[in-house]
């Protein structure tokens, strides 16, 4: 029995619902009484949801899963996962047994956008050309881990003297703090870009230092 799932990972935003698609081709005369369907976590084999003896056996996974009962007879064995969280990320296997047997695995990639970075400067007053300043770029509640890039006002990448730390909160979402140490010129703009590699979402922050006063666009 051929079981079909998407080749590419299913990308789901944290907190939203995701559909893990799985389909099979029922033969003529097929009835749901013949169907055994099992969704399980590929790695641990933990049961997620099942259908057997003509009945939906329900969710075994935090009561956040559902089948599409009206579509099962047409060969749609897809699973709806509600309110996706970081811990759901991974591979799910769809097992279908009628008279024959088949299975396939689909990957769930969880994502959450990073907030617009906030910029802080230390020290933040009485600055002169030649002073060393620390610029911190902070962005919150994203997933997966971000890529952080710094550049100056001319678009030249700044790669030296950058320290980036990422810490997961209780929900598994990351807070990113990137610190740039730089020697001031006469004036200058320093920009931080926090990129979510899955969503291809870029969040920008910048600080312009013009002697006095400073501006935070």
């Amino acid at each position: 029995l051929e079981v079909q799932v998407p080749e590419d990972p299913v990308v789901a935003l944290v907190g939203t619902d995701a559909t893990l698609c799985c389909s099979f081709s029922p033969e003529p005369g097929f009835s749901l009484a013949q169907l055994n369907l099992i969704w399980q976590l590929t790695d641990t084999k933990q049961l997620v949801h099942s259908f057997a003896e003509g009945q939906d056996q329900g969710s075994a996974y935090a009561n956040r899963t559902a089948l599409f009962p009206d579509l099962l007879a047409q060969g749609n064995a897809s699973l709806r996962l509600q309110r996706v969280r970081v811990a759901d990320e991974g591979s799910f296997t769809c097992f279908v047994s009628i008279r024959d047997f088949g299975s396939a695995a689909v990957s769930l990639q969880v994502a959450a956008p990073y907030s617009k970075p906030s910029m802080t400067l230390e020290p933040n007053k009485d600055l002169r050309p030649g002073d060393t300043v620390t610029i911190t770029c902070s962005s919150y509640r994203g997933y997966p881990e971000a890529e952080v890039f710094w550049q100056d006002g001319q678009g030249v990448p700044l790669t030296g003297n950058v320290t980036t730390s990422q810490m997961a909160n209780e929900q598994g979402l990351f807070d990113v703090h990137s610190v740039l140490r730089v020697v001031l010129g006469a004036n200058g703009t320093y920009s931080c870009l926090v990129r979510n590699p899955v969503l291809q979402q870029d969040a920008h922050g910048s600080v312009t230092i013009t002697g006095q006063p400073m501006t935070f666009p």
Epitope: G15, T16, D17, R85, P113, S115, E170, Q171
Partner: antibody, heavy 120, light 108 residues
């Protein structure tokens, strides 16, 4: 049942200060983002400030209040605060305390609000 | 800052009729959009989050749709208690969290 009860509103003059409190019950207060949202008379909703749950307690502010307002929380007392300094006439509004969802930043429970009037 | 524009500002509808109103975002907010209902003298109440998911206790006559920049809240058959102001809110690009200006649903 989740309950949020604001207090501390009143009438003040421009330039004065006020501290709002929000007593929370019915949920694990320390785990959740909490926010203040205000509504000027006859106007729409305006987000003011947010403090995140968990150990980080990151704070965020609307540009209109940055540098004047400070959000804080006391998890041992299940209480959210908003310290408002250098108050202006345009800060006159009903201030609502709102509980964030665990996963995203929308507000699933709101208090009844407390009125702040800034007038000379 | 993402600006949310709600239309119409006021909607006059008779009880039992269908009401549809719009929230348009100045930038893509994916599905990170919520809807609230507010009655005079009361706090807002969450209706819909993540564009389509009804909050606990919200009747199924309320439904949300859309993605990206264009979103819709539909009340399939207006009940007397549905006459209120409805606000949308985005939580994709923050701070700041932003609300739409509101749509007032009044009795025709």
């Amino acid at each position: 049942d989740v309950q949020l009860v604001e207090s501390g509103g009143g009438v003040v003059r421009p330039g004065e200060s006020l501290r709002l409190s929000c007593a929370a019950s019915g949920f694990t207060f320390s785990s959740y983002d909490m926010s203040w949202v205000r509504q000027a008379p006859g106007e729409g909703l305006e987000w003011v400030s947010l403090i995140s749950g968990g150990i980080s307690a990151n704070t965020h502010y609307a540009d209109s209040v940055k540098g004047r307002f400070t959000i804080s929380r006391d998890n041992s007392k299940n209480t959210l605060y908003l310290q408002m300094n250098s108050l202006r006439a345009e800060d006159t509004a009903v201030y609502y305390c709102a509980k964030g969802d665990l996963w995203n930043i929308f507000f699933d429970y709101w208090g009844l609000g407390t009125l702040v009037t800034v007038s000379s | 800052e993402i600006v949310l524009t709600q239309s119409p500002a006021t909607l006059s509808v008779s009880p039992g009729e269908r009401a549809t109103f719009s929230c348009r975002a100045s930038q893509n907010v994916r599905s990170y959009l919520a809807w609230y209902q507010q009655k005079p003298g009361q706090a807002p109440r969450l209706l819909i989050f993540n564009t389509v998911t009804r909050a606990t206790g919200i009747p199924d006559r309320f439904s949300g749709s859309g993605s990206g920049t264009d979103f819709t809240l539909t009340i399939s058959s207006l009940e007397p208690e549905d006459f209120a102001v409805y606000y949308c809110q985005q939580y994709y690009d923050w701070p700041p969290l932003t609300f739409g200006g509101g749509t007032k649903v009044e009795i025709k």
